[in-house]
Every structure is written in C-alpha cells, then in structure tokens.
Amino acid sequence: TEVKVIQPEKSVSVAAGDSTVLNCTLTSLLPVGPIRWYRGVGQSRQLIYSFTTEHFPRVTNVSDATKRSNLDFSIRISNVTPEDAGTYYCVKFQRGSPDTEIQSGGGTEVYVLAK
C-alpha cells in the first residue's frame, strides 16, 4: 500500500511572535527517502525544514525523528512573523538522484494575527 502523508489541520492561526505546530504523520517510512516541509507549491515553493539536515533557525521537529520507527514529522515554527503566512506542505520523497516526490500532505494554511 502506498504511503500516505496526513496533515490533519487545514488551517491554524497564530499571533505574531508566538510559535505554532504544524502536524504531519506518515502511514509508512517506505519507500526510504527524505521528508521535507515546504511553503507554497510549484517552482517557487520554499523549503522550510528538512529532516535530513540541521540549521533551520526558527523551525524544529516536534518528536524525536531519530527513532527508527518514527512516523511523526510535525514541526514547530517559533517567533512567527507576518511573512510566515501561507500554506505549508509536508512532502515525502523516494530516494534517488535526484530524490522524487511521491506524496504530499493536503497542506496547512497558516494565518498570522497581529499582536
């Protein structure tokens, strides 16, 4: 059965300066390959977080993604600004050169409220 990417919330609202959690769970880790979060779609989409590397200043993983059986790829965005508004997608790739996108979550729209 094909892996499914589940983003349970269609939208979340967060006050500027606060943090928010974007939830994402997978039904399987197979086929092997990375999981990444993007804002937007198409050529102009922006990489927000990759579980293959560190150094995403305001974004952290919520659960321990180093567990070999981990299926929770939720992220927390801290100190949210109005520029963070948009629709965020959790995307599963199959390994390759380059990696191939095989499944995306339905997206979670982030609304940023003025403080």
Partner: antibody
Framework: DVQLVESGGGVVRPGESLRLSCAAS????????MSWVRQAPGKGLEWLAG????????YYIDSVKGRFTISRDNSKSSLYLRMNSLTAEDTAVYYC???????????WGLGTLVTVSS | ALTQPASVSANPGETVKITCSGG??????YAWYQQKSPGSAPVTVI????ERPSDIPSRFSGSASGSAATLIITGVRVEDEAVYFC???????????FGAGTTLTVL
C-alpha cells in the same frame, strides 16, 4: 571537529561484564542517534546496537539482545554499552559511531579493544 | 546479507568500481566505509547512497539502483589502498548490516 573517544575496554574472563563508554564532542550530541559497531580480529564490521537521540528507543542485533544494553546520558554527551556474560566470541575492537538522518554512520571513534580470555 | 568482491586492484589514475548487492532499493540505504588497517577507525567516504562528507576527496562517489550500490574512485591514488566495507540500513527491519569488505590494492 566531531570527536568520539571510546574507553572501558580491557581483558576480562568469560562470564564477566564490562561497560564501554564513548565521549562525544564537537557536535550537538542530543540531536543524533548513535550506534555501537565491533570488529573481531581478522573479521569485518558488525553492527550491535543503536539508540535514538532522546534515548527512549533502542535497537539490537539478535545475537546480543538481552545480553548487551545501549544507553546514553545527553547531559554528559556520553554513550554506553553494558556487556554481560561475555564469551571469547565477544573479543573485538568496539567502535561508537554517529548516525546520519537515515541511520548510516558518518563519524567513528578510534575504538576500544575488549579481550575475553580465561 | 550484503555481498561485495573480496579484492580489486588498479593502477594509479585508473577508475575503480566496487559493487555491493543484496539490499532492497525500496527499503535500504547504502554507505561506504574505508579502513586502512585492521582495528583502525573506519572513515565514511559515502553515505546515503551518494553523499560525500565534506572532508572526503571528490574522486570518491557513489550510486545505487535496483538491489546494488557502487563505490567509484575516479583517478585512484596509492593512499586509497584500504579495505572498503559497504554498509546498509534497512528501513523495514531497522537493522544495519555490512558487507565482508573489499581489499583495494593500488599497483
């Protein structure tokens, strides 16, 4: 620079126990899963056990399950391997290794030699 | 189990390919580890099929397809003489495995 330094090896008799340690530096230890790998004299590499970054999940090769225990102390940036009921077949150089995101290894320690002999 | 040739040899400057088979492309990632002498610390030359750590020379590269992985050394040097172990992580079983090692001799 990433550094992994094992200690605790030595000569023990069959049936005895030993605890190996691995001191990590040069990276955020609490963000990485870790593993122990050994190499018997004249043999290849054998993965023994792995542990998640937070320490809650552990994994073992069948041949050491119930006899070896992997653990970590993130406050001390240290990894451990407790080995019980040692036999001559456990004689090897024991390495600690840092795991990549997909549970391969990117950095290795210099190793510590364990000799089990009567 | 991962299978690799026991030995390969090459002249300096030649291209060397070492293959590793036995994994499942659907569930297994590969890496290559260099060991210059028995009991010395292994060095990772490739992980995640084709990713080279920053301190490893660009003559080392890797690829994977089907049930096999390949380590390629382009323009091999005398200092590349070592035993090369392929390693795999199986996302289905959560287990790491190694091949028996390939001894590279540079003539």
């Amino acid at each position: 620079d990433v550094q992994l330094v094992e200690s605790g090896g030595g000569v023990v008799r069959p049936g005895e126990s030993l605890r190996l340690s691995c001191a990590a530096s040069g990276f955020t230890f609490s963000s990485h899963a870790m593993s122990w790998v050994r190499q018997a004299p004249g043999k290849g590499l054998e993965w023994l056990a792995g542990i998640s970054a937070g320490g809650s999940d552990t994994y073992y090769i069948d041949s050491v399950k119930g006899r070896f225990t992997i653990s970590r102390d993130n406050s001390k940036s240290s990894l451990y391997l407790r080995m019980n009921s040692l036999t001559a077949e456990d004689t090897a150089v024991y390495y600690c290794a840092r795991e990549t995101w997909n549970h391969l290894f990117d950095y290795w320690g210099l190793g510590t030699l364990v000799t089990v002999s009567s | 189990a991962l299978t690799q040739p026991a030995s390969v040899s090459a002249n300096p400057g030649e291209t060397v390919k070492i293959t590793c088979s036995g994994g499942d492309y659907y569930s297994t990632y590969y890496a290559w580890y260099q060991q210059k002498s028995p009991g010395s610390a292994p060095v990772t030359v490739i992980h995640s099929d084709d990713e080279r750590p920053s301190d490893i020379p660009s003559r080392f590269s890797g690829s994977a397809s089907g049930s096999a992985a390949t380590l390629i050394i382009t323009g091999v040097r005398v200092e590349d003489e070592a035993v090369y172990f392929c390693g795999g992580y199986d996302g289905r079983t959560y287990i790491n495995t190694f091949g028996a090692g390939t001894t590279l001799t540079v003539l």
